[in-house]
Interface confidence: low
């Protein structure tokens, strides 16, 4: 892969060790927490990264409603068991026997049982809202100019496809990024939604996965675009299945 | 809790055969390569031998390379050793650890309480 | 194979004392190096990976550095409960070949 041959790191992902000991004396890199073989050419995959970061020693609007069967990552962080091509498995459970399935992007879509709990497949998250809030400036950001800076950075720093990018709204204070991938969009090698609303995730909360990178200097027509506040809402291809206890709780 | 516990260990002349055992919990094992280690008796630490997570892979210090067999029942949760053609010099606790995620190349975050043993005639 | 040589093979300190331990490769290995604590009778436990990623549950005052071929362990300031044989490890690839070890006493 093209891990920087010269000192041989990894570019998109800096919670790894490299050496060059590939075929041919490549650089060859690694995830900490897990060991595995990374591919430093695009972006590591959310469950490794979760891994290795539980290594180491949150009226007429054109805004989206997020939908009744949208999830949020309430459950925080947790040491999730990867495939491995380092996506997530369906079941996880923890060190006390306590199981719940998963979606594509790690959330937990059911309610937890034990080690008889079955999740047949690993159920695709096909549609995230990533819902931000800005710092106040001294006046509302020029929409297209919002809509095209958030689209170059998933392009460029994330290296999403721009069609992956459904939309962009903004109603001052609060921007909404949409992305879609279904499962039959998604060829091989395209970079995944879940993966790049992670990064983005890190970026805005200031904790960088890219390697030598500054952090996340986000700016339209030089305006630093500065967040306050993020949530992201998770859709599933699959309603996900909770008990009728907690979706009145 | 997460733990690694051997048995199989003991007594056993020169040239003879003898199979250790290593029972994982509190983890998933099959997701998690697996390595024997061993150490005779006031010595230092040796590498013997790993298995990748699936059991596609193994590899062997040289000096147990057609002598010894490392292998796991995944449905288990079972690494074994399976160590023919025994020599003094294999005298020493056999310790399992657990190695990679996926993989097998990692450091060793978990290891058993060992099992002891002696080649003796 | 890729030699792991260990230095001092031991020594002995007061308990307060910075203490270093070296270990060297015979070829590069970048950052695959681990750090083992070995308290006499007891099973080794794993204190540093990655050259310099301290173990969960590992006091602070153990720390590494290093990469390539020169690697160290140091403890900042030594208590009586650090008395213990220390290895590092190479792992990389096959063989995943330990140091000789250094065992560090209390003067």
């Known amino acids: 892969h093209t891990a920087a041959q010269d000192n041989c790191t990894c570019p998109t992902n800096k919670m790894t060790v490299c050496s060059p000991d590939g075929p041919g004396g490549r650089c060859q890199c690694r995830a900490l927490g897990s060991g595995m073989a990374v591919d430093c050419s695009t972006l590591t995959s959310k469950c490794l990264l979760l891994k290795a970061r539980m290594s180491a020693p949150k009226n007429a609007r054109t805004l989206v409603r997020p939908s009744e069967h949208a999830l949020v990552d309430n459950d925080g962080l947790y040491d999730p068991d990867c495939d491995p091509e380092g996506r997530f498995k369906a079941r996880q459970c923890n060190q006390t026997s306590v199981c719940w399935c998963v979606n594509s992007v790690g959330v937990r879509r059911t309610d937890k049982g034990d080690l008889s709990l079955r999740c047949d497949e690993l159920v695709r998250t096909h549609h995230i809202l990533i819902d931000l809030r800005h710092r106040p400036t001294a006046g509302a950001f020029n929409h297209s100019d919002l809509d095209a800076e958030l689209r170059r950075l998933f392009r460029e720093r994330y290296r999403l496809h721009p069609k992956f990018v459904a939309a962009v709204h903004y109603e001052q204070p609060t921007i909404q990024i949409e992305l879609r991938q279904n499962t039959s969009q998604k060829a091989a090698g395209d970079v995944d939604i879940g993966d790049a609303a992670y990064y983005f995730e890190r970026d805005i909360k200031g904790e960088s996965l890219f390697q030598g990178r500054g952090g996340l200097d986000l700016r339209v027509r030089g305006e630093p675009l500065q967040v306050e506040r993020t949530l992201i809402y998770y859709l599933d291809e699959i309603p996900p299945k909770f008990s009728m206890k907690r979706l009145t709780a | 809790q997460v733990q690694l516990v051997e048995s199989g260990g003991g007594v056993v002349q020169p040239g003879r055969s003898l199979r250790v055992s290593c029972i994982a919990s509190g983890f998933f094992f099959s997701s998690y390569g697996m390595h024997w280690v061993r150490q005779a008796p006031g010595k230092g630490l040796e590498w013997v031998a790993v298995i990748w997570y699936d059991g596609s892979n193994e590899d062997y210090v040289d000096s147990v390379k057609g002598r010894f067999t490392i292998s796991r029942d995944n449905s288990k949760n079972t690494l074994y050793l399976q160590m023919n053609s025994l020599r003094g010099e294999d005298t020493a606790m056999y310790y399992c650890a657990r190695g990679g995620y996926n993989s097998g190349w990692w450091a060793f975050d978990i290891w058993g309480q060992g099992t002891m043993v002696t080649v003796s005639s | 194979d890729i030699q792991m040589t260990q230095s001092p093979s031991s020594l002995s300190a007061s308990v307060g004392d910075r203490v270093t331990i070296t270990c060297r490769a015979s070829q590069g290995i970048s950052h695959f190096l681990a750090w083992y604590q070995q308290k006499p009778g007891k099973v080794p436990k794993l204190l540093i990976y990655?050259?310099?990623t301290l173990q969960s549950g590992v006091p602070s005052r153990f720390s590494g550095s290093g990469s390539g071929t020169d690697f160290t362990l140091t403890i900042s300031s030594l208590q009586p409960e650090d008395v213990a044989t220390y290895y590092c490890q190479k792992f990389n690839s096959a063989p995943l070949t330990f140091g000789g070890g250094t065992k560090v006493e209390i003067k």
């Open positions: 990655a050259a310099s």
